[in-house]
Interface confidence: low
């Protein structure tokens, strides 16, 4: 018929699925795309940058022993041939084809057509509602080994839900009759039959349903509560969550700082067993009796110290050794003259002699001193 068809031309290069079928030589850089529309029409398109301003011709045959026919149904792009539409009614055949520049073959190949099947979009889509379920049916395509996929969503859903069957009879359960749902349907070729290079059909038109009745559209955001209100609630919730998190973090930091600045004062009864029970709080007697390790000099004014309720605390605690830190002489002097001292919670080197308030202790490598 020699018709020049612009039907697919404009959209053809927007489609994916190009095959770089370079076979060396002149074929290099030629991109070919084959789509077998519904086992009815084969569309072969090419993109050969080297020949972008040339009317390439397409020659084909369906059997290896036939003579080549020339395409009579070309696709045009910017006034030049860019593809061919072939009538190939339900043929499970190999397409042998050659793209030529005059008599010179630019590209020659053979391909099983069904590997590039694109089924037609579902037709006669019908919805049958029963309480919280819907059965979506449509006319099965006239050939088999297909999957019929229904996607649906309500404005409450962030993405499409999907269900598929191998006939166009798909029941979706667990729907909320009060919600508005959008549906669309498409057909896909089974990969294990047709291979991985097929194309899904175009989607059917989106249909919206609520309470078993068709709607023009579903509101973009759910109606109850109002869209702006729901956004406000979401933002407010996030802000409150952030504030609470920051508050908890602040409290935790504050607790850490407090613990660092004002260490906990343990009960001396548990740290110095027998000091109060046997020696009635006489520390010198207790230390002599229990350890007998150091000579203690009684400070002047030590008699005025308060009783067992407020003893000088020397905390011996198990702690992991960090970088050992010695007390410098100035610090010792301050303490001796009654100045307040805050010692860091770092362990001191084992075996060091420490004098505090006139008492001298030998510290092991697992001990630290705290006031």
């Amino acid at each position: 018929m020699g018709r020049l068809v612009l039907l697919w031309g404009a959209a053809v290069f927007l489609l994916g699925g190009w095959m770089a079928l370079g076979q060396g030589g002149a074929a290099e850089g030629v991109q070919i795309q084959i789509i077998y529309f519904n086992l009815e029409t084969v569309q072969v398109t090419w993109n050969a940058s080297k020949y972008s301003r040339t009317n390439l011709t397409f020659h084909y045959r369906f059997n290896g022993d036939e003579a080549y026919d020339q395409c009579t149904n070309y696709l045009l792009q910017e006034g030049h041939t860019s593809g061919c539409l072939l009538d190939a009614e339900q043929r499970d055949d190999i397409l042998y084809f050659s793209i030529r520049n005059g008599t010179h073959p630019v590209f020659t190949a053979s391909r099983w057509m069904v590997y590039y099947l694109k089924p037609s979009s579902p037709k006669h889509v019908r919805f049958s509602w029963h309480q919280d379920a819907v059965t979506v049916t449509c006319s099965d395509l006239s050939y088999g080994d297909l999957l019929y996929e229904v996607q649906y969503r309500s404005p409450f859903d962030t993405e499409w839900q999907s269900k598929q069957e191998n006939t166009c009879n798909v029941t979706i359960e667990g729907l909320d009759a009060e919600k508005c749902y959008s549906f669309w349907v498409r057909v896909k070729a089974m990969e294990d039959v047709y291979g991985p290079d097929t194309y899904p059909s175009d989607w059917s038109e989106v249909t919206c349903w609520q309470r078993g009745e068709i709607r023009d559209a579903c509101a973009e955001t759910p109606t109850p509560p109002k869209p702006k209100l729901s956004k406000f609630i979401l933002i407010s919730s996030l802000a409150i969550l952030l504030m609470v998190s920051l508050l908890l973090l602040s409290l935790w930091k504050l607790w850490r700082v407090k613990k660092f600045l004002i260490p906990s004062v343990p009960d001396p009864k548990s740290i110095f067993p027998g000091l109060f029970e046997i020696h009635q709080g006489n520390f010198q007697e207790w230390i002599t009796d229990t350890q007998n390790v150091a000579h203690l000099h009684k400070m002047a004014g030590a008699e005025q110290e308060s009783g067992p309720e407020e003893p000088l605390v020397v905390q011996l605690a198990k702690t992991e050794a960090e970088s050992p830190r010695m007390l410098d002489p100035q610090t010792e002097e301050k303490e001796a003259s009654g100045g307040s001292l805050q010692l860091p919670h770092q362990p001191l080197q084992g075996g060091d002699v420490v004098t505090i308030g006139g008492f001298t202790f030998v510290m092991n490598d697992r001990s630290y001193v705290a006031l």
């Epitope: 009614e89 339900q90 979009s121 037709k123 088999g144």
Partner: antibody, heavy 120, light 107 residues
Framework: QVQLVQSGAEVKKPGASVKVSCKAS????????MHWVRQAPGQGLEWMGR???????ADYAQKFQGRVTMTRTSISTAYMELSRLRSDDTAVYYC??????????????WGQGTLVTVSS | DIQMTQSPSSLSASVGDRVTITCRAS??????LNWYQQKPGKAPQLLIY???SLQSGVPSRFSGSGSGTDFTLTISSLEPEDFATYHC?????????FGGGTKVDIK
């Protein structure tokens, strides 16, 4: 060349059933719908239903529901049986192949027709 | 079901005339409309599919147009073999329906 060849004319009594066959040749693929359309004398065309030769599934026109059955014995031979015949079922019955083209479909090949006469 | 109304139901014309037949659907059927020609004692034959696509082998004097609910079949210059009955058919709905037919006879 695609051909749909139907069985010969039938004369039936009211209340009886008729079974018309349609044998397809000239194409190998089972993936087609076969439709049945009838035409009463001097009247227009009336669609009765479709039958998927591949899947063996039928859709019937509401008017014929419960009275018509479409079947096949192989992928190339389809049957239409109409039961409880009445005199107004007198018509030429056609089997028709549906071609699906992209998102459209149409009847590209028709059988020669089978005249069914219902008369007491 | 979608109702298809064809008009006129019959018309008389002469060879060389331009003939227009219209078909109206009771609801929108997009472009899912086909036209068939039927001669006495014969099965119908496809002329136009998808509202305006000419079936292979059909003379170019036949053309179709329209979408939605209103469609037209035009024969630009009537030939003697064109005297026949013309049927429109919608394939949009799962239940296929035909128009009542338009008989074109010799004036």
């Amino acid at each position: 060349q695609v051909q749909l060849v139907q069985s010969g004319a039938e004369v039936k009594k009211p209340g009886a059933s008729v079974k018309v066959s349609c044998k397809a040749s000239g194409y190998t693929f089972s993936g087609y719908y076969m439709h049945w359309v009838r035409q009463a004398p001097g009247q227009g065309l009336e669609w009765m239903g479709r039958f998927n030769l591949h899947g063996g599934v039928a859709d019937y026109a509401q008017k014929f529901q419960g009275r018509v059955t479409m079947t096949r014995t192989s992928i190339s031979t389809a049957y239409m049986e109409l039961s409880r015949l009445r005199s107004d079922d007198t018509a030429v019955y056609y089997c028709v192949r549906e071609r699906q083209w992209l998102v459209q479909d149409y009847f590209d090949y028709w059988g020669q027709g089978t005249l069914v006469t219902v008369s007491s | 079901d979608i109702q298809m109304t064809q008009s006129p139901s019959s018309l008389s014309a002469s060879v060389g005339d331009r003939v227009t037949i219209t078909c109206r659907a009771s609801q929108s059927i997009s472009r899912s409309l086909n036209w068939y020609q039927q001669k006495p004692g014969k099965a119908p034959q496809l002329l136009i599919y998808a509202a305006s696509s000419l079936q292979s082998g059909v003379p170019s004097r036949f053309s179709g147009s329209g979408s939605g609910t209103d469609f037209t079949l035009t024969i630009s210059s009537l030939e003697p073999e064109d005297f026949a009955t013309y049927h429109c058919q919608q394939s949009y709905s799962i239940s296929v329906t035909f128009g009542g037919g338009t008989k074109v006879d010799i004036k």
